[in-house]
């Protein structure tokens, strides 16, 4: 028969997906490159099922996400169109706010402690959640 | 028992290129993330570069992008750097690291190393 | 790139000596340090990860504290095969920077 495929290990497997949920903070460039050292990426919310499911791992805690416009327009790192994609904004946001006294705007997207989203300043030390696709994930064997 | 053997060092003229080698043994190699760091003789330590489980994603200083390149064979449990317009300010020793994650601490750390290749470039 | 400025760069002790390095982070790392010892001609061995645990092997008479931006490497009695240089190293951040080293001699 056909050899099943999982997540390495502390990671959970979802929808086709693999997904691993910090427990402590770094600015949104050092969890980006955690989750790239881990062979995944921030993790990309391409539906409802999809933030639901995220949502009920982090609880009420602000969460990194694989959102930013950095470079201008907003952009999922793995290159999902962001306009024609998945979108759960709190109210008034994304809004780049200034008046934060830290400089700049806010250029990266985060799980609010209601789940939806704000952009903030990529330098906060929010938690972060990673993702890779199981085939991917299955290719080596899992850290042990 | 944990082992990274270095080897690929020598002497190359400036703008002159070589490829370093590590062979690990003791763990499964393919699941952990690789490092390169160096050490000018008497002097202290700098990292150079990281490669991911997969090579999926590579990492380097600022003083070598664009010059050196980082890959890994899992199937041989080897890591390299490719070293190319190699500069004086190039020379040391070379020691390849292993990455160690502790899921615990959301923390990356560089556990073991070898006993590193030396690296000479004449100008 | 996170600086981290070791002190001293270098110290005179004695057998039996407690003995204190201090690794400053330019800024906050949480625990994401290891401290690592190396003699000359060898490789670094790591003695101290997350900030305070003890590498496996690693006798007790080293401890790591801290947290933040301040980190202390303590031996608490000086044995003769632990004179040989010293090296902090943060993770939190990339790219990965250490300290300066702190040199041990015999005093």
């Known amino acids: 028969g056909s050899e099943r495929t999982c997540c390495p290990v502390n990671w959970v497997e979802h929808e086709r997906s693999c997904y691993w949920f910090s427990r402590s903070g770094k600015a949104w460039a050092d969890a980006d490159n955690y989750c790239r050292l881990e062979d995944a990426h921030l993790v990309v919310v391409t539906s409802w099922e999809e933030q639901k499911f995220v949502q009920h791992h982090i609880g009420p805690v602000n969460t990194w996400m694989g959102l930013h416009d950095q470079n201008g327009p907003w952009k999922w790192v793995d290159g999902t169109d962001y306009e024609t994609g998945f979108k759960n904004w709190r109210p008034e946001q994304p809004d780049d706010w200034y008046g934060h006294g830290l400089g700049g705007g806010e250029d990266c997207a985060h799980f609010t402690d209601d789940g939806r989203w704000n952009d903030d300043v990529c330098q906060r030390p929010y938690r972060w959640v990673c993702e890779t696709e199981l085939d991917k994930a299955s290719q080596e064997p899992p850290l042990l | 028992e944990v082992q990274l053997l270095e080897s690929g060092g020598g002497l190359v003229q400036s703008g002159g290129s070589l490829r370093l080698s590590c062979e690990a043994s003791g763990f499964i190699f393919s699941s952990y993330a690789m490092n390169w760091v160096r050490q000018v003789p008497g002097k202290g330590l700098e990292w150079v570069s990281a490669i991911s489980r997969r090579g999926g994603s590579t990492f380097y200083a600022d003083s070598v992008k664009g010059r050196f390149t980082i890959s890994r064979d899992n199937s041989k449990n080897t890591l390299y750097l490719q070293m190319n317009s190699l500069r004086a300010e190039d020379t040391a020793v070379y020691f390849c690291?292993?990455?160690?994650?502790?899921?615990?601490?959301?923390?990356?750390?560089?556990?073991?190393w070898g006993q590193g290749t030396t690296v000479t470039v004449s100008s | 790139d996170i600086q981290m400025t070791q002190s001293p760069s270098s110290l005179s002790a004695s057998v039996g000596d407690r003995v204190t390095i201090t690794c400053r982070a330019s800024?906050?790392?949480?625990?994401?340090v290891g401290w690592y010892q190396q003699k000359p001609g060898k490789a670094p061995e790591r003695l101290i990860y997350a900030a305070s645990s003890l590498q496996r092997g690693v006798p007790s008479r080293f401890s790591g504290s801290g947290s933040g931006t301040e980190f202390t490497l303590t031996i608490s009695s000086l044995q003769p095969e632990d004179f040989a240089r010293y090296y902090c190293l943060q993770h939190y951040s990339y790219p990965p920077t250490f300290g300066g080293g702190t040199k041990v001699e015999i005093k």
């Open positions: 690291a292993k990455g160690e994650l502790l899921e615990d601490y959301s923390y990356y750390g560089i556990d073991v």
């Open positions: 800024q906050d790392i949480r625990n994401d």
